[in-house]
Interface confidence: low
């Protein structure tokens, strides 16, 4: 019975549990490039780490298929509303999947907020957006974070804006 | 090969999986002491529990090293803006680590919000802040929750403000 | 010693790890029925799945007892404030437990927000509410999501409003 498996399979289960994929990437000054691409992340310094997951150009890359809880938080802030950002234009924060099976990114988890309706034109305002949820990812698929209005993303020391995942 | 291990190690793996560390602590009337210290939590009553984690003076204390998904939600609320809390002064909600390696607390996950810019001076307003992310903790290290403007934290029955963790 | 167990128990531990309960349900046009009941969810199409958990009338149903990280996000939005929704009336988003042991639903995780205080009467506004936390559930217990002001929940393609859980 393939489900009962052998000693080797049990050992493998232990080994894989020991290295159950997980990652936490943190915001850095270079995270927001202003190029329309996904946010970029720190993978090693401070609180950032990769365990059983890869990283490439802003993307967490899976090395094994499975269900993953993926999450991201972005710290938003500004003084009044930046030019062209009316109070009825939302800030969109999302997690997106890239896969060889589709030519375009696939929306996974998305949030919209109207943060700068809170403040008068010259007032400083702050907001935070958190996303998290379980998705199935094949080996080699990539997940990225995008904030369309990336000029509003506030980075600092890696604790305000971050991106992570772990297998469930 | 230390990675293949023995029967005893496999049994240990099963035992530790069975008691994989997890906790969920809930807000109580005594959570906010107004002393400038971290928020305090209920550890046993109602929805609160500790499994493989300790508690001390507001802190979750690890008993084994590893990667933990730590999270906290705080319910914020007020009538207008409390004296001295201008709309451009954010409410800061954070998870912080205490370790023997550093004399001061280390920021792990932090969020800023400008919640009372939403309401006129005499209006009631509500906001909620959620934080969650994976961090590495050594055995004996502590994690606490702080809200600098703790007079704005609204407690009730343990469902609005809470703090938890589990090993990933 | 029951804790050390037998080969069969270790195999069973491996089998159960392989199918550790998890689910992610997504919002659909039929999620908000306007009946005062819980939100309803898509369980199969797109990003939605059930693994070791059941579904019934909006509820995730456990098949085995344990600690679960449960989560939900709802996308809120509107034009100004809907009639009867003053800026001091919060939007309440919560996760609730149904069990045969109690006649009424039990609050697990709850959040309150005052989102439409952000916008003038004719302005479009958006807000998002995320909840997540670890709770203990017995086999057969149910968890549902409620938003009392469900006319403000914005559904679209299953990425904006969702509901999930996994065993920790």
């Amino acid at each position: 019975d393939q489900d009962t498996g052998s000693w080797e399979q049990l050992v493998q289960a232990r080994r894989s549990h020991k290295a159950s994929p997980a990652a936490h990437l943190t915001g850095a000054n270079s995270s927001s490039m202003g190029t329309g691409g996904p946010l970029l992340w720190e993978t090693q310094l401070g609180l950032a780490f990769l365990r059983g997951l890869g990283y490439h150009d802003g993307a967490l890359v899976t090395t094994q298929a499975g269900y993953y809880y993926i999450y991201s938080k972005v710290q938003l802030g500004g003084v009044g509303c930046p030019q062209g950002l009316a109070t009825d234009l939302p800030v969109t924060h999302g997690l997106y999947k890239r896969t060889t099976r589709y030519p375009e990114e696939l929306e996974l988890l998305v949030s919209r907020r109207s943060p700068c309706g809170r403040a008068a034109s010259s007032r400083v305002w702050w907001d935070s957006s958190f996303l998290g949820g379980v998705v199935h990812l094949e080996a080699g698929e990539e997940v990225v974070v995008r904030v369309l209005e990336e000029q509003l993303v506030r980075l600092r020391d890696g604790t305000r804006s971050y991106f992570g995942a772990f297998m469930v | 090969d230390q990675d293949t291990g023995s029967w005893e190690q496999l049994v240990q793996a099963r035992r530790s999986h069975k008691a994989s560390p997890a906790a969920h602590l809930t807000g109580a009337n005594s959570s906010s002491m107004g002393t400038g210290g971290p928020l305090l939590w209920e550890t046993q009553l109602g929805l609160a529990f500790l499994r493989g984690l300790g508690y001390h003076d507001g802190a979750l204390v690890t008993t084994q090293a590893g990667y933990y998904y730590i999270y906290s939600k705080v319910q914020l609320g007020g009538v207008g803006c409390p004296q001295g809390l201008a709309t451009d002064l954010p409410v800061t909600h954070g998870l912080y680590k205490r370790t023997t390696r550093y004399p001061e607390e280390l920021e792990l996950l932090v969020s800023r919000r400008s919640p009372c810019g939403r309401a006129a001076s005499s209006r009631v307003w509500w906001d909620s802040s959620f934080l969650g992310g994976v961090v590495h903790l050594e055995a004996g290290e502590e994690v606490v929750v702080r809200v600098l403007e703790e007079q704005l934290v609204r407690l009730r029955d343990g469902t609005r403000s809470y703090f938890g963790a589990f090993m990933v | 010693d029951q804790d050390t167990g037998s080969w069969e128990q270790l195999v069973q531990a491996r089998r159960s790890h392989k199918a550790s309960p998890a689910a992610h349900l997504t919002g659909a046009n039929s999620s908000s029925m306007g009946t005062g009941g819980p939100l309803l969810w898509e369980t199969q199409l797109g990003l939605a799945f059930l693994r070791g958990l059941g579904y019934h009338d909006g509820a995730l149903v456990t098949t085995q007892a344990g600690y679960y990280y449960i989560y939900s996000k709802v996308q809120l939005g509107g034009v100004g404030c809907p009639q009867g929704l003053a800026t001091d009336l919060p939007v309440t988003h919560g996760l609730y437990k149904r069990t045969t042991r109690y006649p009424e639903e039990l609050e697990l995780l709850v959040s309150r927000r005052s989102p439409c205080g952000r916008a003038a009467s004719s302005r479009v506004w958006w807000d998002s509410s995320f909840l997540g936390g670890v709770v203990h559930l017995e086999a057969g217990e149910e968890v549902v999501v409620r938003v009392l002001e469900e006319q403000l929940v914005r559904l679209r393609d299953g990425t904006r409003s969702y509901f999930g859980a996994f065993m920790v």
Epitope: Q44, G46, R156 | Y102, P103, E104, A139 | -
Partner: antibody, heavy 116, light 107 residues
Framework: QVQLVESGGGLVKPGGSLRLSCAAS????????MSWIRQAPGKGLEWVSY???????YYSESVKGRFTISRDNAKNSLYLQMNSLRAEDTAVYYC??????????WGQGTLVTVSS | DIQMTQSPSSLSASVGDRVTITCRAS??????LAWFQQKPGKAPKSLIY???SLQSGVPSKFSGSGSGTDFTLTISSLQPEDFATYFC?????????FGPGTKVDIK
């Protein structure tokens, strides 16, 4: 009193291997985080690797994949296995302990010379 | 990596002088900064941690200050045994990095 004594240094050819040891005494070794730091002749200090009480490990980019840090709490010893050595690895290697403050005590160092 | 710079790279001073050495981090490191003293042929010795906390057994003529990116080590009255090289080191993020050092010699 606190003592850290390094050993194992010497002359090695490029591509070769060495294993450094650090014997600790005068304190409860298992309670401390430990590091290796090196200093090339006439140059500044460079942190090499760190190992926590529970053997959680970090390396500098310059040695990652070539050096392995380990500890044996029962023997009060810290080790650095150095493989694929290069000329630029020539340095005095120090072990240092860390608890509340970083590197509060250092060993006297051991010289590693990589040359053909 | 966080780059640490020190100024001056060397200085000449007399016994009894007040000496100040500065250290700058390429990004904010809160107060996670240490200072070390090293004499020729010897291992470094810890003087200051957490930017301003005096290591046990270190005389109070040594003091540290600063937070964020700019830090200072001050020796209030230089003594013969203080002629050495001084290094700063950040331990806010991996990899831990040291400054290039400031050599204090006799004028």
């Amino acid at each position: 009193q606190v003592q850290l004594v390094e050993s194992g240094g010497g002359l090695v050819k490029p591509g070769g291997s060495l294993r450094l040891s650090c014997a600790a005494s005068g304190f409860t070794f298992s309670d401390y985080y430990m590091s290796w730091i090196r200093q090339a002749p006439g140059k500044g200090l460079e942190w090499v690797s760190y190992i926590s009480r529970s053997s959680f490990i970090y390396y500098s980019e310059s040695v990652k994949g070539r050096f392995t840090i380990s500890r044996d709490n029962a023997k009060n010893s810290l080790y650095l296995q150095m493989n694929s050595l290069r000329a630029e690895d020539t340095a005095v290697y120090y072990c240092a302990r860390w608890e509340l403050s970083p590197f509060d005590y250092w060993g006297q160092g051991t010289l590693v010379t990589v040359s053909s | 990596d966080i780059q640490m710079t020190q100024s001056p790279s060397s200085l000449s001073a007399s016994v009894g002088d007040r000496v100040t050495i500065t250290c700058r981090a390429s990004q904010g490191i809160s107060n996670y900064l240490a200072w070390f003293q090293q004499k020729p042929g010897k291992a470094p010795k810890s003087l200051i941690y957490a930017a301003s906390s005096l290591q046990s057994g270190v005389p109070s003529k040594f003091s540290g200050s600063g937070s964020g990116t700019d830090f200072t080590l001050t020796i209030s009255s230089l003594q013969p045994e203080d002629f050495a090289t001084y290094f700063c080191q950040q331990y806010n993020t991996y990899p831990f990095t040291f400054g290039p050092g400031t050599k204090v010699d006799i004028k």
